[in-house]
C-alpha cells in the first residue's frame, strides 16, 4: 500500500492532455505551449472495505495544487468537480471518502476511472477537443472514457 501520492501524466487515446483552466479540467491536444497538469494518485488505505472487482480505489489530485477530483450530484445528475482538498488528508481519513474515490481499472495500456459514489459513472472527455472532463454512463459513444497513464519520476 503506497503512502505517498504517485505523480502521473494522463492523456486519452486521441493524445489529448488534461489542462487546468479557470479551476476546470479540460482535455486539449498536446502542443508545445500546453502545460498539462500532473495528477497525483494514491490508493485508498481502506481498500478492503470497498468492492473487490471494480478496480483499485484511488484518490486523484492535482499535483502541488491542493485540488482533488470529486463527484457530486447537481440536480439528479452526478457531476465531476474540483475541490480544494489535500489528497493526504483524504488518504488518512477514518473511512473511505467515496465522493472523492474512483475505481481505477486497467486493461492493457488503457485505464478507466469509475466513481465509487456513483457506480456506473466514469470520468470522460467529449470526442471534441477543448471540452471539460465530465462523468458519463455512456461508454465508447460520444465520450472517451479510456485514458493512458504515464508514471512520472
Amino acid at each position: 500500500k503506497s503512502e505517498m501520492p504517485q505523480p502521473v501524466s494522463i492523456q486519452d487515446i486521441n493524445h489529448r492532455v488534461w489542462v487546468l483552466q479557470d479551476q476546470i479540467l479540460i482535455a486539449v491536444p498536446r502542443k508545445d505551449r500546453v502545460s498539462p497538469v500532473t495528477i497525483s494518485l494514491i490508493s485508498c488505505r481502506h481498500v478492503e472495505t470497498l468492492e473487490k472487482d471494480r478496480g483499485n480505489p484511488i484518490y486523484l489530485g492535482l499535483n502541488g495544487l491542493n485540488l482533488c477530483l470529486m463527484c457530486a450530484k447537481a440536480g439528479d445528475q452526478p457531476t465531476l468537480q474540483l475541490k480544494e482538498k489535500d489528497i493526504m488528508d483524504l488518504y488518512n481519513q477514518p473511512e473511505p471518502v467515496k465522493s472523492f474515490l474512483f475505481y481505477h481499472s486497467q486493461s492493457g495500456r488503457n485505464s478507466t476511472f469509475e466513481s465509487v459514489a456513483f457506480p456506473g459513472w466514469f470520468i470522460a472527455v467529449s470526442s471534441e477537443g477543448g471540452c471539460p472532463l465530465i462523468l458519463t454512463q455512456e461508454l465508447g459513444k460520444a465520450n472517451t472514457t479510456d485514458f493512458g497513464l504515464t508514471m512520472l519520476f
Epitope: 478492503e48 472495505t49 470497498l50 468492492e51 482538498k85 488518512n92 481519513q93 477514518p94 473511512e95 471518502v97 467515496k98 465522493s99
Partner: antibody
Framework: EVQLQQSGAELVKPGASVKLSCTVS????????MYWVKQRPEQGLEWIGR????????KYDPKFQGKATLTADTSSNTAYLQLSSLTSEDTAVYFC??????????????WGQGTTLTVSS | QAVVTQESALTTSPGETVTLTCRSS?????????ANWVQEKPDHLFTGLIG???NRAPGVPARFSGSLIGDKAALTITGAQTEDEAIYFC?????????FGGGTKLTVL
C-alpha cells in the same frame, strides 16, 4: 428530518444472543456509514464497530470481534447489531449513530435514542 | 489500546468561555486522530458537534469550536449558555479503531 429509531429494551439470559435494530428515516443508509457504540454507567463510550450498508462490509473494535455482528438491510433502511454469548458485562445501553462526510470531515452527527440491554438470569 | 482522558467535570457561568480537553495516553493528539466531539443531554440525546479536529457539524452553533491545544484536543464554548449544560465526549481515531473519553460533565450556572 433525519431520525434513527432503535428497538426497545431487552432483558435476556446469560449465554443467549440478541439482535438490536436501528431504523433510519430522512436519508438512505447506503449513502453513509453506520456506527454502533456501547455505554455503561460511569464508563464512557466504547466503539463497537461500523458497517458500510452499500456493500455490507463491517469492521470491529478488536474487543468486540466475535461478540458483535453488524448487518444492514438497505431495503428497509435498517442497521442491526447482534450480540452473542451474553454475560453481565454486556449489560449496557447500545447506540447506533450515523458517521457522515460533509464537505471536509466525518461527523458522528445523528444518534439513535439507545437500546437498554440487561443480561440477567 | 490507548486511553483517552477528559476532565470529569467543569463548571462555568452563562456568557463565559470554557475549554474542555481530551488527552491520549499514546502521546500528543494530532490532526490524524480526527478528534470528534459529541454532546449528551438527559435521556440519551446525543448530537455530533465537531469532526476532524476543528470542523463544526452543520447546524451546530458557532460558539462551539474544536482545536488542538498543546498535546491535547480541545472543545471551546465561547459564551456558554444554560442549554449547553450536558456531558461532552471526545473520540479519537487510532488507525483502525475509535477510542472515546469518559466524558466531561459541564454545569452552566
Amino acid at each position: 428530518e433525519v431520525q434513527l429509531q432503535q428497538s426497545g429494551a431487552e432483558l435476556v439470559k446469560p449465554g443467549a444472543s440478541v439482535k438490536l435494530s436501528c431504523t433510519v428515516s430522512g436519508f438512505n443508509i447506503k449513502d453513509t456509514y453506520m456506527y454502533w457504540v456501547k455505554q455503561r454507567p460511569e464508563q464512557g463510550l466504547e466503539w463497537i464497530g461500523r458497517i458500510d450498508p452499500a456493500n455490507g462490509y463491517a469492521k470491529y473494535d478488536p474487543k468486540f470481534q466475535g461478540k458483535a455482528t453488524l448487518t444492514a438491510d438497505t431495503s428497509s433502511n435498517t442497521a442491526y447489531l447482534q450480540l452473542s454469548s451474553l454475560t453481565s458485562e454486556d449489560t449496557a445501553v447500545y447506540f447506533c449513530a450515523r458517521f457522515h462526510w460533509y464537505d471536509s470531515a466525518f461527523y458522528f452527527d445523528f444518534w439513535g435514542q439507545g437500546t437498554t440491554l440487561t443480561v440477567s438470569s | 489500546q490507548a486511553v483517552v482522558t477528559q476532565e470529569s467535570a467543569l463548571t462555568t457561568s452563562p456568557g463565559e468561555t470554557v475549554t474542555l480537553t481530551c488527552r491520549s495516553s499514546s502521546g500528543a493528539v494530532t490532526t490524524s486522530n480526527y478528534a470528534n466531539w459529541v454532546q449528551e443531554k438527559p435521556d440519551h440525546l446525543f448530537t455530533g458537534l465537531i469532526g476532524g479536529t476543528n470542523n463544526r457539524a452543520p447546524g451546530v452553533p458557532a460558539r462551539f469550536s474544536g482545536s488542538l491545544i498543546g498535546d491535547k484536543a480541545a472543545l471551546t464554548i465561547t459564551g456558554a449558555q444554560t442549554e449547553d449544560e450536558a456531558i461532552y465526549f471526545c473520540g479519537l481515531w487510532y488507525s483502525n479503531h475509535w477510542v472515546f473519553g469518559g466524558g466531561t460533565k459541564l454545569t452552566v450556572l
